[in-house]
C-alpha cells in the first residue's frame, strides 16, 4: 500500500513497505537503473518481511524499486519509488607513523564501508620513481611499507576505489630514518679470564649482534660469539691472564649490517697465592696466614699431612675472603706439611706449602696407687713443674655400674686421697692435665678396694657365776683396737662397753652376775670405721653355795649347812665320802633349803662333804669342808 | 528437481565467523544463474526466517532485524554454489540455516537439509 525508500546511501538503499495484514506469500523486488542502462535485479522475500536493505548499487545513480505481493495466487498492484544513491564519501586525512630506517606505516581515515579497497603508490622523491604500488582491502586503515631506503624522501599517494569510481588522491611526504649504527662500546669488569663488553645502539629490533674478540698480537684465530639483538652486554669468559686483546661488534637488523665498533683492552694477571705462614703453634694446633690477590678466589684449599704420612690426611675448604685458618684438634710433637690452593671459577693456583711442627705436651706420667684399703686408696703421679694449669681425676667402678666421680685439682697438685669408696671392687683411674686450654693423654691405673675386714667366730667358754671368756678371729694387721659391747638381755642393768687394742683375740669377762643371760657384740675399729659385728649370747655360771658348817656331830650323825647363792635354785646336793675311801653317798634337797642332817656314818671318821647347787642340767662349783664323827661312846 | 546441500557450520565463540556453503545439483537442464537464492533460518522454539537473498543478477538484499550488516550473501555460477559470511557471530545467530531456490514460480520451492551453526558466549 505504501513503499519508501530510507537511508538512500552512496551504495545502498534501505526500503520500507507496508501491507495490510493478508497472509501474503511473498513479495518481489524490482531494482533497476532509472535510465535502464543494466538488467533489473529481482528479488523475491517472504511474506511476512516489511523491510531490506539493498547494497551494492552504484554510486550518485538514480534507481527505479518496484515491489508486489502475491496472496493465495493472486499479484497486488505493483508499487514503485524513485531514488538516487549519494556521491562517493571523500578520504579523511592520510598520516605516518612509525618512520624507520627501511619501513614505515602508513594510517588514513574514510568513512566505513565507503571503499572496496585502497590504491597506494609510492615514489622516491629525488628519482619520482614509483618504487611500490599496492592495493589494500576498503576495510583497512592502516598499511606497513617495507623495504624503503634509508635516509630517503618518499611521496606517498592514497585513493580510496569503489566498483566504479576513484577518489581524488590523498598524498604525504616522509624522510625514512638514518641507517641503524651502534655506539658507546665499552669495557667493563675486566678480570684476569674475562671481560664484559657494554654498547649502545639507536632503539631497534635488532636481530642478533656479531662479537669478535681475537688477541692483539693475531696469534689465535678470532672468537665469534652470536648473541640475541635484546642484549647490551656480555660477559666474555675464557681469555688469558695479562693479555692485551681487541674487541669488535655490529649489529645485525633486516640483513643489514652495521659499520663494526671495536675497542682494545688487556686482561689482568693470573691470581696468585703466597707468603704461606705459621704461627701460635702449642701441643694440637696452629695458625696460618697467607697472601693472595683479591677479589678472585671463590674458595681456598687447605691440606695437612703430617711428615710421616702416618695420620689420615686432613683437608678444609675456607671462603676465598679468608687470609688466615685456625687448624687444630693436631697430635702434639708432630711434623706436618701444609698445602695451599686457591680455587676461582675457572683456576686452581699453584699449590703452595709450608711446614710445622706441633709443641710437645708436658710431661704427665708415673700414675701410682698406693694406701689401698677397704674404703679407698691414694692416687699420685708426676708432672713437669709449672706446666699444668689443673689436673683431672675421673674415677670410676671397673663394672661402669656407677656414675664416674671427677675431681679437679689445681696444676701444683700431685696427689688426692680417695675415701669412702666401696669395699672389695675394682676401680679404674684416669689422671690427665690442662695447659692452655688442651687436656694431655690421661695416664690410667687399675685397683681393687680391700675387702671389708671382718671379725668372726666369737666363741664364749669358762664361764662363771661372775663372768666368762671371749675370744674371736679377725683378719691380721687391719683393725686398730676391738670393742665389746655387754648387756643382760633382760635389760636390767646398763651396758657395759669395753675396748682393747688391736693384737688381742681374747678378753675375760668378770663382775658379772651370776646366772645371767647377756647379750655380746665385738667389732673392729679400723681407720675409724667400725667393721660389720658378730655377736654371741652367754649365760654366766650358777653362783656356789658358801661358808659351809657343820653342828650337831655324833658318832652317826652330823648336819651340815650354807648360805645358798643369790640367785635362785632349783635343788642343792650334797655329796660326802670317807677321806680313807669308800663309796659316795648323796643327798638333794630343795633349793631354798640351807641346811640337811647327814645320817648313818661311821663314828671316828673323817668325811669331805660338798654341797653344789642346780638349775636344769646346770651345776655349780662346790663348797668343800670335813668333819669327824663322834667314837663310840 | 533441485536438491541443495549446505554445509560450513559449526560451533565457534561469541565474536567469530562463519562462511556457509550452499551447493545445488539436479538443476534439470537450466543453468544455476537461472536461479536467484536465499538463506534462512531457524532458532529452537522460533519460525523460520529470512536472512537475504541474492538474485539471479547478482544483486543482494537482507533482513536489516537478522543481518544487521554483518552478513555477506555472494555466488559463485561456475561452482553452482551460494555462500553467506556471517561476522561478528552473537549468541541469537544460533539456528540451523538453510538456503533456498525460487525457482520458475517466484517462491521458494527447493529447500536443502540445513546447517546448526552453534555461537558460545
Known amino acids: 500500500e505504501n513503499l519508501t525508500v530510507t537511508e538512500a546511501g552512496w551504495d545502498g538503499l534501505r526500503l520500507n513497505w507496508t501491507a495490510d495484514d493478508l497472509a501474503y506469500e511473498y513479495f518481489v523486488i524490482q531494482v533497476q537503473e532509472a535510465n535502464n542502462v543494466e538488467t533489473a535485479h529481482n528479488f523475491t522475500v517472504p511474506g511476512n518481511l516489511r523491510a531490506a536493505d539493498i547494497p551494492g548499487l552504484k554510486v550518485a545513480t538514480s534507481y527505479r524499486v518496484s515491489i508486489y505481493g502475491v496472496a493465495r495466487g493472486y499479484r497486488t498492484p505493483v508499487l514503485s519509488a524513485e531514488t538516487s544513491t549519494g556521491t562517493t564519501p571523500n578520504l579523511g586525512e592520510v598520516t605516518v607513523a612509525e618512520v624507520g630506517w627501511d619501513a614505515l606505516t602508513l594510517n588514513w581515515t574514510a568513512p566505513e564501508g565507503a571503499y572496496k579497497n585502497f590504491f597506494i603508490q609510492v615514489l622516491e622523491a629525488d628519482t619520482t620513481q614509483t618504487v611500490q604500488n599496492l592495493t589494500v582491502p576498503g576495510g583497512l586503515r592502516s598499511v606497513d611499507l617495507p623495504g624503503l631506503k634509508a635516509a630517503t624522501r618518499y611521496y606517498i599517494t592514497l585513493r580510496g576505489v569503489t566498483q566504479d569510481f576513484g577518489t581524488a588522491p590523498l598524498s604525504v611526504e616522509v624522510l625514512t630514518e638514518d641507517l641503524p649504527q651502534l655506539g658507546g662500546l665499552s669495557v667493563t669488569e675486566v678480570s684476569w679470564d674475562g671481560l664484559t663488553l657494554n654498547w649502545t645502539t639507536d632503539d631497534l629490533a635488532y636481530k642478533h649482534f656479531v662479537v669478535q674478540v681475537q688477541e692483539a698480537n693475531n696469534v689465535e684465530a678470532a672468537q665469534n660469539l652470536t648473541v640475541p639483538g635484546s642484549l647490551r652486554a656480555v660477559d666474555i669468559p675464557g681469555l688469558k691472564a695479562d693479555t692485551p686483546y681487541r674487541v669488535s661488534i655490529y649489529g645485525v637488523i633486516q640483513g643489514y649490517r652495521t659499520p663494526m665498533l671495536s675497542t682494545d683492552v688487556s686482561t689482568a694477571r693470573e691470581p696468585e697465592i703466597g707468603n704461606l705462614n705459621v704461627s701460635d703453634v702449642t701441643p694440637k694446633s696452629f695458625n696460618l696466614s697467607w697472601t693472595a690477590t683479591d677479589g678472585i678466589f671463590d674458595m681456598f684449599t687447605i691440606e695437612i699431612i703430617d711428615s710421616n704420612r702416618l695420620l689420615q690426611t686432613a683437608e678444609h675448604n675456607i671462603s676465598g675472603a679468608e687470609r688466615t685458618a685456625h687448624i687444630s684438634g693436631l697430635p702434639p710433637s708432630t711434623d706436618f706439611i701444609v698445602y695451599l690452593s686457591g680455587i676461582a671459577p675457572s683456576i686452581r693456583t699453584k699449590t703452595i706449602s709450608t711446614t710445622a711442627t706441633t709443641e710437645a705436651l708436658p710431661l704427665l706420667e708415673n700414675l701410682t696407687i698406693s694406701d689401698t684399703n677397704p674404703y679407698g686408696f691414694t692416687v699420685s703421679w708426676t708432672a713437669s713443674e709449672n706446666a699444668f694449669d689443673s689436673f683431672l681425676v675421673t674415677v670410676v667402678d671397673s663394672g661402669k655400674l656407677l656414675d664416674p666421680q671427677e675431681f679437679t685439682l689445681s696444676g701444683t697438685q700431685r696427689k688426692l686421697e680417695l675415701r669412702g669408696l666401696i669395699t672389695g671392687i675394682g676401680y679404674e683411674v684416669l689422671v690427665s692435665g690442662f695447659t692452655q686450654g688442651h687436656q694431655t693423654k690421661p695416664l690410667r691405673a687399675e685397683t681393687i678396694t680391700e675387702a671389708e675386714p671382718e671379725v668372726d667366730n666369737l666363741l664364749v667358754s669358762d664361764a662363771t657365776p661372775d663372768g666368762f671368756r671371749l675370744s674371736w678371729t679377725a683378719d691380721e694387721g687391719i683393725f686398730d683396737s676391738f670393742v665389746i659391747r655387754i648387756r643382760d638381755t633382760k635389760k636390767q642393768s646398763e651396758p657395759q662397753e669395753i675396748s682393747l687394742p688391736s693384737p688381742e683375740r681374747t678378753r675375760d669377762i668378770t663382775g658379772l652376775r651370776e646366772a645371767t643371760e647377756y647379750e655380746i657384740e665385738l667389732y673392729g675399729i679400723s681407720r675409724g670405721r667400725r667393721s660389720q659385728p658378730v655377736s654371741a649370747i652367754a649365760t654366766t655360771a650358777m653362783g656356789s653355795p658358801k661358808e659351809i658348817m657343820f653342828s650337831d656331830i655324833t658318832e652317826n650323825a652330823a648336819t651340815v649347812s650354807w648360805r645358798a647363792p643369790t640367785a635362785q635354785v632349783e635343788s642343792f646336793r650334797i655329796t660326802y665320802v670317807p677321806m680313807t675311801g669308800g663309796a659316795p653317798s648323796m643327798v638333794t634337797v630343795d633349793g631354798t633349803d640351807t641346811e640337811t642332817r647327814l645320817v648313818k656314818l661311821t663314828p671316828g671318821v673323817e668325811y669331805r662333804v660338798s654341797v653344789i647347787a642346780m638349775k636344769g642340767f646346770e651345776e655349780s662349783d662346790p663348797v668343800s669342808g670335813t668333819l669327824i664323827t663322834a667314837l663310840d661312846g | 528437481d533441485v536438491q541443495l546441500q549446505e554445509s560450513g557450520g559449526g560451533l565457534v565463540q561469541a565474536g567469530g565467523s562463519l562462511r556457509l556453503s550452499c551447493v545445488a545439483s539436479?538443476?534439470?537442464?537450466?543453468?544455476?544463474?537461472?536461479?536467484?537464492l536465499g538463506w534462512f533460518r531457524q532458532a529452537p522454539g522460533k519460525e523460520r526466517e529470512f536472512v537475504g537473498a541474492i538474485s539471479m543478477t547478482g544483486g543482494t538484499i537482507y533482513n536489516p532485524d537478522s543481518s544487521k550488516g554483518r552478513f555477506t550473501i555472494s555466488r559463485d555460477n561456475a561452482k553452482n554454489t551460494v555462500y553467506l559470511q556471517m561476522n561478528m557471530l552473537k549468541a541469537e545467530d544460533t539456528a540451523v540455516y538453510y538456503c533456498?531456490?525460487?525457482?520458475?514460480?517466484?517462491?521458494?520451492?527447493?529447500w536443502g537439509q540445513g546447517t546448526q551453526v552453534t555461537v558460545s558466549s
Open positions: 539436479g538443476t534439470s537442464g537450466l543453468t544455476f544463474r537461472s536461479f536467484g
Open positions: 533456498a531456490v525460487n525457482g520458475l514460480g517466484l517462491n521458494y520451492d527447493y
